[in-house]
């Protein structure tokens, strides 16, 4: 008889999860030779150890510490790019601007990007049927705790001028409940981070408003200033042109505003 399995509200573990994590680790070390010291089998074992056989609503940041230790990486000062609700453009940007890094450009973020996973208490099985949903089931689930852990670490290690890309099309351009708003903002270290520069990405072609004056941006500025970090904000009116100008800065049309 099939054993009873807890039914959660979220989708189950991504198919081929172990194979995907191991393959991504191998790919990452291939194209980032500075990470060749990383043993991918050990990385998978540490990843697995964080959630296998554990009740998936009782995962802690401590569970992920062995993995975090194995995936230790540093970003040069002034090269950290945070993002909120605008992942694709942030990744398109770092694909072109190769010396800047989002969390998903780092080993641990790359391993887990777009994946879902969870186990079950007291069994070595991975649950491919369902996993806890953050809202409907619990916040201390394997995926949410992972991203909270690695996001905290990513923010803690940032230095110099930190950039953040924000989605100007959303009702809350800065959302206190996002990972950026609830974790990263509060873990930037004032003794290492001189400034946070927000890039507000406009959605509409004809949108010429100064979204840096948005109340939620003012709220972000207040939080950051209280932490003794300077705050700057820029409107990116034309994201397509912005990317094109990052690719070809000499283009004559790039001398005007974007």
């Amino acid at each position: 008889l099939p054993r009873w399995r807890q039914q959660w509200s979220g989708s189950g573990t991504t198919s081929r999860f172990p194979e995907t994590v191991l393959a991504r680790c191998v790919k990452y070390t291939e194209v980032h030779p500075e990470m060749r010291h990383v043993d991918c089998q050990s990385v998978w074992d540490a990843f697995k150890g964080a959630f296998i056989s554990k009740y998936p609503c009782n995962i802690t940041e401590e569970d992920y510490q062995p993995l975090v230790k194995l995936g230790t990486q540093t970003v040069p000062c002034n090269k950290t790019l945070l993002w909120s609700r605008i992942k694709d453009l942030a990744h398109q940007f770092t694909q072109v601007q190769r010396d800047m890094f989002t969390l998903e450009d780092m080993l641990l973020g790359y391993l887990a990007d777009d994946l879902t996973w969870c186990g079950e208490f007291n069994t070595f099985e991975i649950n491919y049927q369902s996993c806890p949903d953050w809202r409907k089931d619990c916040s201390n689930n394997p995926v949410s705790v992972f991203w909270k852990t690695v996001s905290r670490r990513f923010a803690e290690t940032a230095c110099g001028v930190v950039h953040v890309m924000l989605n100007g099309s959303r009702s809350k351009i800065f959302d206190k409940n996002s990972t950026f708003g609830s974790v990263e903002v509060h873990n930037l270290q004032p003794e290492k981070v001189q400034a946070l520069e927000a890039w507000v990405i406009h959605g509409g072609r004809e949108d010429s408003r100064d979204l840096c004056q948005d109340p939620t941006i003012k709220e972000l500025e207040s939080i950051i200033s209280k932490r003794n970090i300077r705050f700057f904000c820029k409107n990116i009116y034309r994201p397509d042109k912005f990317l094109q100008c990052v690719k070809n800065p000499e283009d004559s049309s790039c001398l005007s505003g974007i």
């Epitope: 393959a23 191998v26 291939e30 030779p33 991918c40 694909q95």
Partner: antibody
Framework: EVQLVQSGAEVKKPGATVKISCKVS????????MNWVQQAPGKGLEWMGW????????DVAEKFQGRVTITADTSTDTAYMELSSLRSEDTAVYYC?????????????WGQGTTVTVSS | DIQMTQSPSSLSASVGDRVTITCKAS??????VDWYQQKPGKAPKLLIY???NDYTGVPSRFSGSGSGTDFTFTISSLQPEDIATYYC?????????FGGGTKVEIK
Amino acid sequence: EVQLVQSGAEVKKPGATVKISCKVSGYTFTDSVMNWVQQAPGKGLEWMGWIDPEYGRTDVAEKFQGRVTITADTSTDTAYMELSSLRSEDTAVYYCARTKYNSGYGFPYWGQGTTVTVSS
Amino acid sequence: DIQMTQSPSSLSASVGDRVTITCKASQNVDSDVDWYQQKPGKAPKLLIYKASNDYTGVPSRFSGSGSGTDFTFTISSLQPEDIATYYCMQSNTHPRTFGGGTKVEIK
């Protein structure tokens, strides 16, 4: 069995563009980076660039930047290498190649090669 | 870019002879050097990876050694089927770079 099968030979005029394909089988396409290597007649091997098919992220050697575009189609398990503004010195055999887990970072798997001739 | 200087560019030896090819990297590449055999009209074939590891199915007469900047590839007893061009490649840093090749012929 891992296989990398490349498209057939091409003859192109200077200034034209060539697009070579590399269709894979025997493994999950998105699980490995695909590399491209050039070999001009009587010359050695030159690494051109790579693509991570899962994300479409690429890196191209400086010598080929601006002329080489590497893409991947995960629906057909096929990688592509496009070389534009062709000149006579681009006459070469082009290979796709990939690594194997636990065999360092060399290339145990290669396509059979695609000959590109650039001639007016 | 890291230069891989391979020597000799060609050699002629008798069947049963010991053949040695060297590769010198312009900077430290640890042990990230691979050796390939290429026969006319064919794709290269991986023989040795990470300086000294035999790839699966490769005859034991092929071996490699070295680390840092100096690497050696050896055929302990040359066979007629070993007529080919041999290349070293460093896989330590992007871009990967190859040596100029050594053409091996039978006397």
